[in-house]
């Protein structure tokens, strides 16, 4: 569950559940910074614009990131 904050981390809870790349509107990867010491991944779904914080350590999420980057590299000339 993400919370908007100017300081500190955004994600309050994280999900290990795999997400279908085709149902993704947007995938934000927020690198660790002075505000939050960990990487955060926030998925925005096409349906209702629902958001979900994903666990960067989860195997399913790592596979999702690979699939998304592969999809992007296909699209870019």
């Amino acid at each position: 569950v993400p919370l908007s904050r100017t300081v500190r981390c955004t994600c309050i809870s994280i999900s290990n559940q795999p997400v279908n790349p085709r149902s993704l509107e947007k995938l934000e990867i927020i690198p660790a910074s002075q505000f939050c010491p960990r990487v955060e991944i926030i998925a925005t779904m096409k349906k209702k614009g629902e958001k979900r914080c994903l666990n960067p350590e989860s195997k399913a999420i790592k596979n999702l990131l690979k699939a998304v980057s592969k999809e992007r590299s296909k699209r870019s000339p």
């Epitope: 919370l3 904050r5 500190r8 981390c9 994600c11 979900r52």
Partner: antibody, heavy 121, light 109 residues
Framework: QVQLVESGGGVVQPGRSLRLSCAAS????????MHWVRQAPGKGLEWVAL????????YYADSVKGRFTISRDNSKNTLYLQMNSLRAEDTAVYYC??????????????WGQGTTVTVSS | EIVLTQSPGTLSLSPGERATLSCRAS???????LAWYQQKPGQAPRLLIY???SRATGIPDRFSGSGSGTDFTLTISRLEPEDFAVYYC??????????FGPGTKVDIK
């Protein structure tokens, strides 16, 4: 099954301290934000505090800020509420509740049975 | 701080009737952030609705939620004997506190 069990409640004098515990089982505790919510006798629900899944984020209701501290031990699957400088108005049933992670906000989907704190001289 | 107001305070109805509970926010709440809970005497609350309109796991379809902005509604299409309880709305805005409404008691007429 998914379960939260609170303990540590009791009768305490004003100004004294108490520590509540909440033991979690049946789910990946280290993925979930956790809340404390209280309910004074015959009254409604009052959100008390929230801690992020890894303990980095902590948030408090104004009524307890500076007196209560929420913490967690993911290796023990346990949530805590340290309550200092207790007042009569802190008398309530204290519930721990899970912040469901599979969505933007799915509410508090699992609750403990509650532990009673009575502050009285 | 967002303040939630629930009306009516008490709703006296008979089994089989339709119940309409209102929750009004002092400022706009994203519908993603509005939940409804049911609480019976001596029990912990139970999540019914999240995201203003999505039913939680295992919640019967006679419960439905709607609304946006500052006005939200919980509807119980046909009251069953086990539905007589207190109902709370809660907002989970972009910053704490995550306030609850004062509750609506649904009791048997």
């Amino acid at each position: 099954q998914v379960q939260l069990v609170e303990s540590g409640g009791g009768v305490v004098q004003p100004g004294r301290s108490l520590r509540l515990s909440c033991a979690a089982s049946g789910f990946t505790f280290s993925n979930c934000g956790m809340h404390w919510v209280r309910q004074a006798p015959g009254k409604g629900l009052e959100w008390v505090a929230l801690i992020g899944f890894d303990g980095i984020n902590e948030y408090y209701a104004d009524s307890v800020k500076g007196r209560f501290t929420i913490s967690r031990d993911n290796s023990k699957n346990t949530l805590y509420l340290q309550m200092n400088s207790l007042r009569a108005e802190d008398t309530a049933v204290y519930y721990c509740a899970r912040d469901w992670p599979e969505g933007y906000y799915n509410g508090m989907d699992v609750w403990g049975q509650g532990t009673t704190v009575t502050v009285s001289s | 701080e967002i303040v939630l107001t629930q009306s009516p305070g008490t709703l006296s109805l008979s089994p089989g009737e339709r119940a309409t509970l209102s929750c009004r926010a002092s400022q706009s709440v994203s519908s993603s952030y509005l939940a409804w809970y049911q609480q019976k005497p001596g029990q912990a609350p139970r999540l019914l609705i999240y995201g203003a309109s999505s039913r939680a796991t295992g919640i019967p379809d006679r419960f439905s939620g709607s609304g946006s902005g500052t006005d939200f509604t919980l509807t119980i299409s046909r009251l069953e004997p086990e539905d007589f309880a207190v109902y709370y709305c809660q907002q989970y805005g972009s910053s704490p506190p995550f306030t609850f409404g004062p509750g609506t008691k649904v009791d048997i007429k």
